[in-house]
């Protein structure tokens, strides 16, 4: 059965910061998603071999991709509290196939001991929720990010 | 359509205190990075200073020509920016544009802008 | 804090010309620029970010490029409505800094 390998589990860093999310599968995808979970889960980009990526409000003009759908990795910068959340890679495949997750905890650069990953990877039923709305213009439809096939919960 | 509506603006005696308003319309203004930019007469874009949302600490980041003497803050329950101008100086006149700043640093979306002149 | 400094300030060219517009930084910016268009009496609008990322709505005859100190405008065939003033903005920290301005005219 197709999967989808997720890296790392768990990274804090501080504010202004970068981090890079690692989503890997063995082929025969559309294309990948990459979500922040939360009572409101959030598309951030959507990659897909030979078509522009696209990417929410928000994150624009600070994430970067680099390797291919198969094997991406995802590179967001200039990070600010309200990213600090759960970022999980949904593979578009005949069934959707979901990464464990990446928990990314930002911190005040003073605060740098409060907040520590533990070892364990993030479940799914136990994630901090990420700050209600995203990016800017009010209408949705402005981060014009495909709609996944089927439902987008998950499972 | 997200539109910036500044007001505030007129002419202002030197050491004058206005305070310039600026309305947001259709944004999520809560989770919006709001700054000031100002053009003089005939002149360049300088950066004033910027607020962040509450979300990311909302603080506030000033240019060096207006630190200790210009205040921003927002109003989130009513949409709405401010920025306070005290002892203002005859190198303070302007057009001052409210700004929507990205999270990345640059500026998607801008007011029309309002003048203030400061002149005895 | 960051200099950014544009060439040329004016320049004349004709409808249909392909118009190169230059701007430098101080010290490296990585890609950390855009570029804005402004027209008399108007409020700046954006056209390109992170050196060469069109926004959305701008016409693709507009291009960016360039990274660490050098960063460049193109507008490959020149419009009636591209007469205006251009200016390159740098947001490498958090203290931005724009270019003086280029002023593209009619020759």
């Known amino acids: 059965a197709q999967e989808v390998q997720q890296s790392p589990h768990c990274t804090t860093v501080p504010v202004g910061a970068s981090v890079n999310i690692t989503c890997s599968t063995s082929g025969g995808l559309r294309g990948i998603y990459l979500r922040q979970l939360g009572p409101q889960p959030q598309d951030i980009i959507y990659y897909e071999d030979g078509v522009v990526p696209t990417t929410d409000r928000r994150f624009r003009g600070r994430i970067d991709f680099s390797g291919s759908q198969d094997n991406l990795t995802i590179t967001m910068h200039r990070l600010q509290l309200s990213d600090t959340g759960t970022y999980t890679c949904q593979a578009i495949t005949e069934v959707n196939v979901y990464g464990s997750g990446t928990l990314v905890l930002v911190t005040e650069e003073q605060s740098q001991g409060w907040h520590r990953c533990s070892d364990a990877p993030p479940r799914a039923s136990a994630l901090p929720a990420p700050p209600t709305g995203s990016a800017l213009p009010d209408p949705q439809t402005a981060s014009a990010l495909p709609d996944p096939p089927a439902a987008s919960a998950l499972p | 359509e997200v539109q910036l509506v500044e007001s505030g603006g007129g002419l202002v005696k030197p050491g004058g205190s206005p305070r310039l308003s600026c309305a947001a319309y259709?944004?999520?203004?809560?989770?919006?990075?709001m700054s000031w930019v100002r053009q003089a007469p005939g002149k360049g874009l300088e950066w004033v200073g910027r607020?962040?949302?509450?979300?990311?600490?909302?603080?506030?980041d000033y240019a060096a020509p207006v630190k200790g003497r210009f205040t921003i803050s927002r109003d989130d329950s009513k949409n709405t920016l401010y920025l306070q101008m005290n002892s203002l100086k005859t190198e303070d006149t302007a057009v001052y544009y409210c700004t929507i700043e990205a999270v990345a640093g640059h500026f998607d979306y801008w007011g029309q802008g309002t003048l203030v002149t400061v002149s005895s | 804090d960051i200099q950014m400094t544009q060439s040329p300030s004016t320049l004349s060219a004709s409808v249909g010309d392909r118009v190169t517009i230059t701007c430098r930084a101080s010290q490296s910016i990585s890609s950390w620029l855009a570029w804005y268009q402004q027209k008399p009496g108007k409020a700046p609008k954006l056209l390109i970010y992170?050196?060469?990322s069109l926004e959305s709505g701008v016409p693709s005859r507009f291009s960016g490029s360039g990274s660490g100190t050098e960063f460049t405008l193109t507008i490959s065939s020149l419009q009636p409505d591209d007469f205006a003033t251009y200016y390159c903005q740098q947001y490498n920290n958090y203290s931005p800094t724009f270019g003086q301005g280029t002023k593209v005219e009619i020759k």
């Open positions: 607020i962040k949302s509450k979300t990311d600490g909302g603080t506030t």
């Open positions: 259709g944004v999520t203004f809560s989770n919006a990075w």
């Open positions: 992170k050196a060469s």
